[in-house]
């Protein structure tokens, strides 16, 4: 009996530009002789319902259709057909076929493969055209896919013990696609500081697929209006 | 980090006073105020009141009016919870709490209050 | 003073069951309500804050929601580590007041 196993769950999360190695075991009755055996890798992209072929390994024969691919021969030994992709882009996304014959068997898998870029975020203050007492907090999320962000205002005042979120006064832009392929966002706060307490901690909170914590920016309101002491919390998958 | 440390337990007989510390370390100690809770054995837990930590304001839960006072000793970082006029009902674990961080809000370890006779 | 009320107060599950607990308070608090987890002999955790935002480090499995007078915490496959006691808490004024808990056991 020969089987296939793929990563659980279907899907493969990756960071873009990582070296990526998509899982495939092989599990047979017996011991794997790789002289042979072979081992096929396609995919198939997003965009398109076409299948390609990225790697082919039988017997004596290896070849590499996309470049760097690599299945390692001494691992296949033990039953791991796992493909190695250096240098992952986001438009190589989308489903991955393990294909494995052992004569007269065959046997396959397919994983879907998600490529996602952190965003990197920043803290800006723009007092241009505001009124006294009256300042402008922008937060800037760049470089980040999918697409999909969510950015959110919290404040915690010193009384009480959990933030709380900012719902008046926020305006979110459209998100905006770089020629990489990546996205950037603004989502601005309005603030009028005479209003506030001093010691209030504001943040910019953002939260996106890549990320297994949220992206923090925040900054303090002192007796002397704010210190925009931004500070940065990136977790980002590994 | 962040580290409040309460005193040890106590025991009391109904009628005296106790007073439980709270010992901060780890951040800027008078950014910041702190609540004491009260969770009797096997219930829920109550907020008894706060003060801030540069000692010019309190606030207190109108049920623990006239039975507890806050201070605090600036140069100790440390924050004072006074119970007067114990009675049984008062036999409970008191917690000093401060808001948090990305983490949750922060509080100690407790400090068991016996009230027997 | 806004009021609390917890349910159930206590329940037994399995480890994977999906468990909900459910806070209702007195009159509207927004979404300024958090959850905590207490273990016995120790100080409680926080695991929600604003209703439905978890804390860094709190596992996926946990979620809140609810606005208004309404409010539930999920967990949505039980792990051993969180059988434990979960409490409520308003925090839109003072007093602060919490739940009287809900006892999560072991079946």
């Known amino acids: 009996d020969l089987k296939v196993e793929m990563m659980a769950g279907g899907t493969q999360i990756t960071p873009l530009n990582d070296n990526v190695t998509i899982f495939c075991n092989i599990f047979y009755s017996q011991p794997l002789n790789i002289t042979s055996m072979g081992i096929t890798w396609f995919w198939k992209s997003l965009t398109f319902d076409k299948e390609v072929k990225v790697f082919e390994f039988f017997g004596d024969h290896q070849e590499a259709f996309r470049p760097g691919a690599i299945v390692s021969p001494w691992r296949l030994k033990s039953g791991d057909a796992s493909l190695r992709l250096p240098g992952i882009q986001l438009e190589e996304a989308g489903e991955y076929r393990c294909e494995v014959v052992v004569t007269p068997l065959k046997a396959q898998g397919t994983v879907q493969l998600e490529v996602v870029a952190s965003p990197a975020s920043r803290l800006l203050l723009d007092q241009v055209g505001m009124k006294e007492n009256e300042d402008k907090y922008m937060c800037e999320s760049s470089g980040f896919y999918p697409e999909a962000i969510n950015i959110t205002w919290e404040k915690q005042t010193q009384k009480f013990p959990h933030p709380i979120e900012i719902s008046e006064d926020v305006i979110t832009g459209p998100t905006i696609k770089n020629m990489d392929g990546t996205f950037n966002v603004t989502s601005c706060l309005k603030l009028n500081s005479s209003q506030e307490d001093p010691g209030t901690v504001y943040q910019c909170v953002v939260r996106h697929a890549s990320l297994h914590t949220p992206l923090r920016s925040n900054f303090t309101l002192t007796a002397a209006r704010h210190s925009l002491s931004e500070t940065e919390k990136t977790d980002n998958f590994s | 980090q962040v580290q409040l440390v309460q005193s040890g337990a106590e025991v009391k007989k109904p009628g005296a006073s106790v007073k439980v510390s709270c010992k901060a370390s780890?951040?800027?100690?008078?950014?910041?105020?702190m609540n004491w809770m009260k969770q009797a054995p096997g219930q829920g837990l109550e907020w008894i009141g706060g003060i801030y930590l540069n000692g010019d304001s309190t606030d207190y839960n109108e049920k623990f009016k006239g039975k507890v006072t806050m201070t605090v000793d600036t140069s100790t970082s440390t924050v004072y919870m006074e119970l007067s006029s114990l009675r049984s009902e008062d036999t409970a674990v008191y917690y000093c709490?401060?808001?948090?961080?990305?983490?949750?809000?922060?509080w100690g370890q407790g400090t068991l209050v016996t009230v027997s006779s | 003073d806004i009021q609390m009320t917890q349910s159930p107060s206590s329940l037994s599950a399995s480890v994977g069951d999906r468990v909900t607990i459910t806070c209702k308070a007195s009159?509207?608090?927004?979404?300024?309500v958090a959850w905590y987890q207490q273990k016995p002999g120790k100080a409680p955790k926080s695991l929600i804050y604003?209703?439905?935002n978890r804390y860094d480090g709190v596992p996926s499995r946990f979620s809140g929601s609810g606005s208004g007078t309404d409010f539930t915490l999920t967990i949505s496959s039980l792990q051993p580590e969180d059988f434990a006691t979960y409490f409520c808490?308003?925090?839109?004024?003072?007093?602060?007041?919490f739940g009287a808990g809900t006892k999560l056991e072991i079946k």
């Open positions: 009159q509207n608090v927004g979404k300024y």
């Open positions: 709490t401060r808001r948090g961080d990305y983490f949750g809000d922060f």
């Open positions: 780890g951040y800027t100690f008078t950014n910041y105020w």
């Open positions: 604003s209703a439905s």
């Open positions: 808490q308003q925090y839109i004024s003072y007093p602060l007041t």
